[in-house]
């Protein structure tokens, strides 16, 4: 058993890109308070297992009124520590959520209004009994500076608060094989209460006679390394000969979770997923009501007027979980169309579009030819997010702005001579051929392959290609 302690040093504007507005005004004075939520382990916080290690609420800070025109300073803080008692072993690794709340003290109907100012979260390793650890976390334009530590409650000592200490029986020294209890030098480490022979390196216990194994070890005394080779059974304790797991009691056997909680195994122990209204390592803590403010991030608490009725948190957009403790990854909803890149700016989303697409959500398939004129009579052809001009004869280049030699491709057939013309090319056909490109032979009897020659043109005259 022990206590996690959190000391808030300052809450104010951070060095980031935007200066936050002061949360209070002359019209609406307010005061701050803080909430901390702790969970064991470094894993991603499960939405349905809030604050399994415990939670705490600070006192209200001094009333603050904004000075008109002044940037938001560091805001006045509540006195004292936030303390989260833990009943069992300190897990060594933990996740935290610290929220800064504003209580508005204007003339609200129905009492003061609460709103969330900032939320920070992190995962840390921490040994119980160690010094204060300092931290700085940023939430948007706000910065929170704080320190934390975990300390054991007597008679527990050690980095996990699992060793017990007792007052010395003799004034000068401890009994055989027992060390003084640092930092309580006037006490001695109690005799080991774990199962006899339990490995001191790979096993631990929380109750007398227990021997629980750390990850990677198994066996009744946690002396057998877990083999990574294929084994038939999913869990231990292991067979001493093979190192493979054989059927045996698991940490969830008998369901240690109270009040209808469901148990899931973790590498070191187990974790309880608690129903609404209950929390704690084994769902043993009950009596949470809406008055306790269990809904994070501005969630609206409904029901739960008394400890026997469950509350429900209605979460604001962007948050989910039974206590609205999980931020929705808005980009995971893939709001940007057509393969656009999604950026969550906090106050909004930003879509960066792939070539050929545009719009706030990349929803517009660009008409590649829209607003792009091909010069000199060229026509625009769309394709792949870029436009291409099909140029009229005599012109070339991306936009048909470059003059081209229309005769370069030798367009006149059957030995016809090509002449460049202001609107294209002209073919002067060799005797016996006619047509715009001299492609039609003139038949010996004087009839051509064409239905009729245009008026005023004789076979053999130059034909202008229009």
């Amino acid at each position: 058993a022990g206590v996690f302690e959190l000391q808030i040093h300052s809450f104010g504007p951070g060095p980031g890109p935007g200066a936050p507005r002061s949360p209070c005004s002359a019209r609406l004075p307010c005061r701050l308070f803080f909430r901390v939520c702790l969970k064991p382990g470094l894993s991603e916080e499960a939405a349905e297992s809030p604050c399994a290690l415990g939670a705490a609420l600070s006192a209200r800070g001094p009333v603050y009124t904004e000075q008109p025109g002044a940037p938001a300073p560091d805001l006045p803080l509540p006195d004292g520590l936030l303390q989260v008692p833990f009943r069992d072993a300190w897990p060594g690794t933990f996740s935290f959520i610290i929220e800064t709340w504003r209580e508005e003290l204007g003339d609200q109907i129905g009492g003061p209004a609460w709103s969330l100012l900032a939320r920070v979260a992190g995962r840390r390793r921490l040994a119980a009994g160690g010094p204060w650890a300092r931290d700085i976390q940023r939430a948007g334009a706000w910065e929170l500076r704080f320190s934390y530590r975990a300390r054991c409650e007597p008679p527990a000592v050690g980095t996990a608060c699992t060793r017990l200490c007792r007052p010395r029986s003799a004034p000068s020294r401890c009994g055989p094989g027992l060390r003084p209890c640092a930092p309580l030098e006037d006490e001695c480490e109690a005799p080991l209460v774990c199962r006899a022979g339990c490995s001191p390196e790979h096993g631990f216990c929380e109750q007398p006679g227990e021997c629980r194994c750390l990850e990677g070890w198994t066996g009744p005394l946690c002396t057998v390394p877990v083999s990574t080779s294929s084994c038939l059974s999913p869990r231990g304790p292991s067979s001493a000969t093979t190192g493979c797991l054989v059927p045996g009691p698991g940490p969830c056997d008998g369901n240690p979770c109270a009040n209808g909680g469901s148990c899931s195994e973790t590498p070191r122990s187990f974790e309880c997923t608690c129903p609404r209204g209950f929390y704690g390592l084994r769902c043993e803590v009950s009596g949470v009501t809406c008055a306790d403010g269990p809904c994070f991030n501005g969630g609206l608490c409904v029901g739960g007027a008394d400890p026997d009725s469950a509350y429900i948190c209605h979460c604001p957009p962007g948050f989910q979980g039974s206590n609205c403790e999980k931020r929705v990854d808005r980009c995971s909803l893939q709001p940007c169309r057509n393969g656009g890149l999604c950026l969550d700016l906090g106050h909004a989303l930003r879509c960066r579009c792939r070539a050929g697409f545009a719009g706030p959500r990349c929803e517009h398939d660009l008409d590649d030819c829209a607003g792009r004129a091909c010069a000199n009579g060229g026509t625009c052809v769309e394709g792949g997010g870029a436009h291409r001009c099909s140029c009229a004869l005599g012109f070339g280049g991306r936009d048909c702005r470059e003059r081209a030699d229309p005769c370069a491709a030798r367009p006149c057939a059957h030995g016809g001579r090509c002449y460049a013309h202001f609107s294209g090319l002209v073919c002067a056909c060799a005797p016996g051929y006619m047509g715009a490109r001299c492609e039609f032979p003139v038949h010996p009897d004087g009839a051509s392959a064409l239905p009729a020659a245009p008026p005023g043109l004789r076979p053999g005259d130059p034909q202008r290609y229009l």
């Epitope: 890109p17 948007g140 957009p317 929705v328 909004a348 960066r352 579009c353 959500r361």
Partner: antibody, heavy 128, light 112 residues
């Protein structure tokens, strides 16, 4: 007609403070960010800060942090407060609108990333 | 923060000619590029956004292209009214969580 008009510029002493105001008319102030951009004589535009009108979120250039504060003062006006003015702050200060777009059922508004309406600017000269 | 580099700093062309202005971003900005025209004593005017989408009322003589880090503004059939300074601009979002805007240094277009 959509319009932005800046005011509050003029000749100020080094070290002084100044508040510039931008008044909007002809369009709905919401679903837009109102921004400040300055331009020193003969130089290119330099973005200072924006405030997103829907929730009051402010964001600013890293170099502007601390001395420049953008605020929304009414449903049609924003201000830029500048402290500790130096000669390097001499510039025309423009108010500009950066549109945001909302869609029914979408999780958020969407930033456009550009400025589609500008005020004529107000000249700030810092000199002793 | 992102850096936008414009070239050339100045360009001269005759009426009816074509001018090409380049803008390079220091990182991939996809199509997040806008172009502005500014005349002396006036604020910048948005010509184009999303690299190639013309703003309403801007003549089709103005065209934009590019993607990623390299972008181009082309003005064809130059008119005297096109004499101005042109700026490219993008927005950025850094891993530290800061969002903002950056402009290029500008290109002065002189029409003969």
């Amino acid at each position: 007609q959509e319009q932005l008009v800046e005011s509050g510029g003029g000749l100020v002493q080094p070290g002084a403070s100044l508040t510039l105001t931008c008044k909007a008319s002809g369009f709905d102030f919401t679903s837009n960010a109102m921004c400040w951009v300055r331009q020193a004589p003969g130089k290119g535009p330099e973005w200072i800060a924006c405030i997103y009108n829907d929730d009051g979120s402010a964001y600013s250039a890293s170099w502007a942090k601390g001395r420049f504060t953008v605020s929304k003062t009414s449903s049609t006006a924003v201000t830029l407060q500048v402290t500790g003015l130096t000669a390097a702050d001499t510039a025309t200060y423009f108010c500009a609108r950066s549109p945001y777009y909302t869609y029914g059922g979408a999780p958020s508004a969407y930033a456009s990333g550009y400025f589609n309406l500008w005020g004529p600017g107000t000249l700030v000269t810092v000199s002793s | 923060d992102i850096v936008m580099t414009q070239t050339p700093a100045s360009v001269e062309a005759a009426v009816g000619g074509t001018v090409t202005i380049k803008c390079q971003a220091s990182e991939n900005i996809y199509n997040s590029l806008a172009w502005y025209q500014q005349k002396p004593g006036q604020p910048p005017k948005l010509l184009m956004h999303d690299a190639s989408v013309l703003t309403s009322g801007v003549p089709s003589r103005f065209s934009g292209s590019g993607y990623g880090t390299e972008f181009t503004l082309t003005i064809s059939d130059l008119e005297c009214a096109d004499a101005a300074t042109y700026y490219c601009q993008s927005d950025y979002y850094s891993t530290g969580g800061s969002y903002g805007f950056a402009f290029g240094g500008g290109t002065e277009v002189v029409v003969k």
